[in-house]
């Protein structure tokens, strides 16, 4: 049993003599009727009217009226498409003059049921100028002087110089606030490799393969270790300044205190960490008397070593 066709809902158009025909629906497959399209729309054949057929799959054409879009005149653009007709679903590139473009950095417009999307117009876009680039000891590849948003350009360093990551060439990008960076070509003999590792400590940042002169890297020590020296190292003439040392803490254990019949004064810790230079106060356990000088009960931590007082 072939499904008949209901009265066609022709968007942006209608059947000729619609009211006279409506009572005779649904109709059988094979029937056809003349229809028209509203202003700014046309039939798939490019006319303002045509025939719509009832088929086994429903009405044909499925979209009887298509939007017509005429390409407007572009201020600040190239007008090779000016006045040309495009039909719903068609897209075309918009060619704007340097420094101009479609909103949101788009490059194409599409004829939709509602008209052009986006509207073809060339607006002033964010650009970057070649004259804003300072490059010493290298070259910019491009010949243009103005670059549009998101444009990436290459630069290269002369022999004996390298980019911050040690390559012979690099790139910068035109961003909303100007160039992403200035090209860097540094003397290969002046750059540094990764900073030296230190015992019981580490750098606070992710390490790079190459550092430019005057780069600074910060170190930190593991918990309870004390940093001695500057916590920063600086790259200069291809070498890093002296890194800091991480000084061992003194670990006061219950085992050592029991051996000497002592305990921590005013604390009940079973294990206690003291930094270099810290004073640790001990006292004799109940029933024991000092066997070493009174001064020894105020022991000073020296790079992981502490001299325990003794009680007998």
């Amino acid at each position: 049993q072939v499904k008949p066709c209901d009265f066609p809902d022709i968007k942006h158009g209608g059947l000729f003599h619609e009211n006279m025909r409506r009572p005779y629906f649904p109709v059988a497959v094979g029937k056809y009727y003349s229809y028209y399209c509203d202003e700014h729309f046309e039939t798939p054949s490019g006319s303002y009217w045509d025939y719509i057929h009832c088929t086994q799959n429903g009405w044909s054409p499925a979209v009887p009226c298509l939007r017509k879009c005429y390409f407007p005149y572009l201020e600040n653009g190239y007008n090779q498409n000016y006045g040309r007709k495009f039909v719903q679903g068609n897209s075309t590139e918009v060619a704007c003059h340097p420094g101009y473009g479609l909103p949101k950095a788009q490059t194409t417009v599409t004829c939709t049921e509602k008209g052009w999307s986006p509207t073809p117009r060339c607006i002033r876009v964010r650009t970057c100028s070649k004259s804003d680039i300072e490059i010493e000891n290298g070259f910019i590849s491009e010949s243009s002087s103005i670059y549009i948003l998101n444009k990436e350009i290459q630069y290269k360093c002369k022999p004996g110089y390298a980019t911050a990551d040690g390559n012979s060439s690099g790139s910068i990008t035109c961003l909303q606030n100007g160039w992403s960076a200035q090209p860097i070509c540094i003397n290969s003999s002046e750059k540094c490799g990764p900073p030296p590792p230190i015992s019981n400590g580490d750098t606070t940042s992710f390490l790079l393969k190459v550092y430019v002169p005057q780069s600074r890297v910060e170190y930190q020590c593991q918990p309870y270790y004390e940093l001695q020296g500057s916590n920063y190292v600086t790259c200069s003439n291809g070498e890093w300044s002296e890194p800091p040392r991480c000084i061992h803490p003194c670990i006061i254990t219950e085992e050592n205190m029991n051996k000497n019949n002592i305990k921590l004064k005013g604390r009940s810790d079973r294990k206690y960490y003291a930094k270099t230079g810290d004073t640790i106060e001990f006292m004799c356990k109940l029933g024991y008397n000092a066997n070493t000088s009174i001064l020894s009960f105020q022991a000073v931590c020296r790079e992981g070593i502490v001299e325990y007082p003794r009680c007998e």
């Epitope: 022999p159 012979s168 060439s169």
Partner: antibody, heavy 114, light 107 residues
């Protein structure tokens, strides 16, 4: 170690086009922007022809600019030289090189003769 | 274009001699200059870059000096394998240009 190898016809007719290719092995053509062509007429000095960046940008010797095209093919890891409207004065050994690290091809002699 | 001139155009010297070749640029090229050696039938090879930096693997008897418009290549003690042609090349500005060369042969 990067190696460069020129290839192309050793004989070109006057007014014809000289076409040479430089195959890069042992490294990626995208790792440098200094892919260069130089030539040396028999018994004479060296002349810089031009260069290409891996993004396709070029710089040419103005004395040859109207006749020369240097292009890069990243998919084949090679770059090429085309010199149009050649005369006997274009007879030379043509070298391709990577200028930054100083890697050279072995050179290829191109003779312009009918 | 920047013109490069070299002197002398040729010289004869003996093994062990100190040899000096001069290169002049028609305008200031800072230190953007390289020196190349080419033996007959062989590929050129860079000896010096940035006017005075020795290319890796090049013997220390080769040295370069100068800045601006006047540059010198010196071979402190000429060896048998140094008999060749020498070219200077400026890479300060496009087009890169080379000197006409200096031929060093055996006296």
């Amino acid at each position: 170690q990067v190696q460069l190898q020129e290839s192309g016809p050793g004989l070109v007719k006057p007014s014809g086009t000289l076409s040479l290719t430089c195959a890069v092995s042992g490294g990626s053509i995208s790792s440098s922007n200094w892919w260069t062509w130089v030539r040396q007429p028999p018994g004479k000095g060296l002349e810089w022809i031009g260069e290409t960046y891996h993004d396709g940008s070029t710089n040419y010797n103005p004395s040859l600019k109207s006749r020369v095209t240097i292009s890069v093919d990243k998919s084949k890891n090679q770059f090429s030289l085309k010199l149009s409207s050649v005369t006997a004065a274009d007879t030379a050994v043509y070298y391709c090189l990577e200028f930054y690290f100083d890697y050279w091809g072995q050179g290829t002699l191109v003779t312009v003769s009918s | 274009d920047i013109q490069m001139t070299q002197s002398p155009s040729s010289l004869s010297a003996s093994v062990g001699d100190r040899v000096t070749i001069t290169c002049r640029a028609s305008q200031d090229i800072r230190n953007d200059l390289g020196w190349y050696q080419q033996k007959p039938g062989k590929v050129p090879k860079r000896l010096i870059y940035a006017a005075s930096s020795l290319q890796s693997g090049v013997p220390s008897r080769f040295s370069g000096s100068g800045s601006g418009t006047e540059f010198t290549l010196t071979i402190s003690s000429l060896q048998p394998e140094d008999f060749a042609s020498y070219y200077c090349l400026q890479y300060n500005n496009y087009p890169f240009t080379l000197g006409p060369g200096t031929k060093v042969d055996i006296k």
